[in-house]
């Protein structure tokens, strides 16, 4: 027989198949020119000394081969003795050490076989109804097409699936998608209408992350407030490895996840940007307000579900450095001034309300005054801070009000509202003797004593009725009690309390009379 | 010793909130996370959140979310965990548990928490 | 959430045979953030194993964990008397979800 003829004799091999594992597969033939065809075909095991022959058998029953040796393609023309105008099953015999292995047959008229491409360049991927939709233009002159897709995860084996006819210069294919496991999709094509052509090769590996993205474990914490009025915000993370199929290994488009770092400062809400999102590697400075944190997790198909994070504000208190002055038109606060061209936030809420919304005011840009200090004003007819009781304020600052991780605290402190002097008057003051020249004066705490820090001091003041002469006792914000000595006995006394504040002088109680009795020895 | 010490069992009706806490020793308090787990009558283990003792900062799981508020108080080494809006489902032993290197490797002795009307 | 199922429910053994406890995930358990506790009744979890497969301080030598990705074992290679109690396996990979509980009882 002549090599690029088909011969039709016994082959010079023994007919048996022996069943194994190895062996031809994944036979294909088609059409390559107007008067030339191909078959290929793949060859699983060792290929030492192995011998492949293309087997035919025409619709009369007549067969042939082709004798390829070790290669497993083969070329020849519409002369080589193969029907090509008519049904033809073609299958491989490879011989090897004495055994002949057969591929499974295909069954097809070689001139309507067409060598169809894969879906070639750019597959789309998105997700639609809970499924994944794949998209691809349709290779050129190939309209009208049976496409087939197999898919693995990690720990499964392919999976075949079936895309339907495509009829288009587009081609689509609705695919399963797995909730938390990445896969592996390749595409397949073949002439539609001619069952028992060729498919073509699988495409290139299309690989699709999970719907959800892994949510990474993550530590947050926070450095102290620093000078500055910022804080670092650092981060400790568990590393997180998404599982790949084989074919996604290595730098595969597609099943990446990025995290971000949702940032959203819950202090100062009337601010112009409550939220920002950054790039987890940046880790930012916060002001001292309270945030809540998140990170979020996202891949092609969006944000997985996030875990957020709540970072309470910094409730360190400076000494004073607020200036607070009540006049006739209203009322000013005063505080040492940052930079030029700096927006001020000044939050205040009523202690012991802290679940509630703060009252919050944003200054245009200012500049320091001539002294230094920033300044914030407002009528009394805005009732701001009126009631008589304590208030706890946060000033912030920021020169970029716009961008969150630019704000910074100036100042968070305390402070009475309303009539401090006449609300901070105690009561209930008693004088009780505590020996033959002194006595012991208690009073109910000062409401003032309620608001961390300002309470400066209690005065206790103490007025001889007779010769009219007046003794004042400075005592610590925190007793509420004091003994006064050398007394005389039989003499009237008036005793009057007040609290201060470090701006304020307090207004005295109500004068309480006592005297001590004169001991009258026997 | 290294310990977590829980307060003692609470009895509350429908509705109402409970605080529970627990004492740490025998370690640097804010070095460590912790935890609150519980554990309903005869069933298994819940994470409820955490809290980072040295900024106050917290996460909870979803399903406690806006009820649940984890504090902590450093003068004392204390760490508290409010549950409010109590259900009787809510009826569990409540767990404080230190974090190690993300897994829990030192557990109080639990909060016996009644709800019932 | 990932969840956890733990196999069997119940496991009657006698002192000096072998206990092996399953730990099934619903999805792959990454770099294998999984610890085992064992609980006495009345009494708070004790941490026997952390990362699949190290024992934590004090935990003897009979006690310990494998496995990878969804699959993990605990194998107890003696029972003494003290280790009859309820074994749960927990990941710490993606928040924190335990087992239902493997209870070892005596038989």
């Known amino acids: 027989c002549r090599t690029s003829e088909c011969c039709f004799q016994d082959p010079p091999y023994s007919d048996a198949d022996s069943g194994s594992a190895s062996g031809p597969r994944d036979l294909s033939c088609y059409r390559i020119s107007s008067a030339g065809y191909e078959c290929s075909w793949q060859y699983e095991g060792p290929t030492a000394g192995v011998s492949h022959f293309l087997r035919c058998c025409l619709s009369s029953g007549r067969c042939c081969y082709f004798a390829t040796g070790s290669a497993t393609r083969l070329q020849f023309s519409d002369q080589a003795g193969v029907s090509v105008l008519h049904t033809v099953t073609l299958w491989v015999e490879s011989w090897a050490r004495n055994r002949t292995e057969k591929s499974p047959e295909v069954t097809l008229q070689l001139y309507k076989s067409v060598k169809y491409k894969p879906p070639l360049g750019d597959i789309k991927v998105s997700k639609l109804a809970g499924q994944l939709r794949m998209e691809w233009e349709t290779p050129d002159n190939q309209v009208g097409a049976e496409v087939q897709f197999r898919h693995r995860t990690p720990s499964s084996s392919w999976k075949l699936g079936d895309c339907g006819p495509q009829d288009d210069d587009t081609e689509s294919c609705l695919c399963p998608l797995e909730m938390n496991v990445a896969q592996e999709f390749q595409l397949r094509r073949r002439r539609l209408g001619s069952q028992g052509s060729s498919w073509s090769k699988w495409s290139s590996p299309v690989c699709v992350p999970p719907e959800n993205p892994p949510q990474p474990q993550v530590r947050f914490s926070v450095e102290q407030l620093g000078r500055d009025g910022r804080r670092r915000l650092t981060l400790k993370e568990q590393p997180t490895q998404l599982e790949l199929p084989e074919g996604c290994q290595g730098p595969a488009p597609g099943v990446e996840v990025t995290y971000q770092l949702q940032l959203h400062m819950l202090s100062c809400p009337c601010k112009a940007k409550a939220t920002r999102t950054l790039p987890l590697e940046k880790m930012p400075y916060l002001s001292g307000a309270a945030y809540n944190v998140a990170v979020i997790s996202s891949n092609r198909f969006g944000p997985g579900p996030n875990q957020t994070w709540h970072i309470p504000a910094d409730t360190h208190t400076e000494p004073v450095a607020l200036n607070i002055s009540v006049g006739t038109n209203g009322t000013t606060m005063y505080w040492p001034a940052r930079a030029q061209s700096t927006t001020y936030c000044i939050e205040w809420q009523p202690v012991g309300q802290e679940g509630s919304l703060a009252t919050c005011n944003l200054t245009a840009p200012q500049d320091p005054d001539p002294a230094g200090m920033a300044t914030y004003s407002w009528s009394r007819e805005s009732g701001a801070m009126g009631q008589e009781k304590c208030y706890h304020i946060t000033i912030f600052a920021s020169a970029h009000p716009k961008k969150l991780t630019l704000w910074s605290t100036v100042l968070s402190t305390y402070h009475f509202g309303g009539n401090a002097s006449a609300a901070g008057t105690p009561h209930h003051v008693s004088v009780k003797n505590h020996s033959l020249d002194s006595v012991s004066v208690d009073w109910a705490p000062s409401l003032l004593s309620t608001c961390p820090g300002v309470l400066k001091e209690y005065v206790v003041r103490c007025r001889d009725e007779d010769s009219n002469q007046v003794s004042e006792h400075p005592v610590q914000p925190t007793e509420t009690q004091v003994t006064l000595s050398d007394l005389r006995a039989g003499v009237a006394y008036t005793v009057q309390v007040r609290a201060d504040t470090a701006w304020l002088r307090g207004a005295w109680s109500q004068p309480q009379r006592f005297s001590i009795k004169v001991q009258v020895s026997d | 010793q290294v310990q977590l010490v829980q307060s003692g069992a609470e009895v509350k009706k429908p509705g109402a909130s409970v605080k529970v806490s627990c004492k740490t020793s025998g370690y640097t308090f804010t070095s460590y996370y912790i935890h609150w787990v519980r554990q309903a009558p005869g069933q298994g283990l819940e994470w409820m959140g955490i809290i980072n003792p040295s900024g106050g900062i917290t996460s909870y799981a979803q399903q406690f979310q806006g009820r649940v508020t984890m504090t902590r108080d450093t003068s004392t080494s204390t760490v508290y965990m409010e549950l409010s809006s109590l259900r009787s489902e809510d009826t569990a032993v409540y767990y404080c548990?230190?974090?190690?290197?993300?897994?829990?490797?030192?557990w109080g002795r639990g909060t016996l928490v009644t709800v019932s009307s | 959430e990932i969840v956890l199922t733990q196999s069997p429910g119940t496991l009657s053994l006698s002192p000096g045979e072998r206990a092996t406890l399953s730990c099934r995930a619903s999805?792959?358990?990454?770099?294998?953030?999984l610890a085992w506790y064992q609980q006495k009744p009345g009494q708070a979890p004790r941490l026997l194993i952390y990362?699949?497969?190290s024992r934590a301080t004090g935990i003897p030598d009979r006690f310990s964990g494998s496995g990878s990705g969804t699959d993990f074992t605990l194998t107890i290679s003696r029972l003494e008397p003290e280790d009859f109690a309820v074994y749960y396996c927990?990941?710490?990979?993606?928040?924190?979800?335990f087992g239902q509980g493997t209870k070892l009882e005596i038989k």
């Open positions: 999805q792959s358990v990454s770099s294998s953030y």
């Open positions: 927990q990941q710490y990979g993606s928040s924190y979800t």
């Open positions: 548990a230190r974090e190690g290197d993300w897994y829990f490797d030192l």
């Open positions: 990362g699949a497969s």
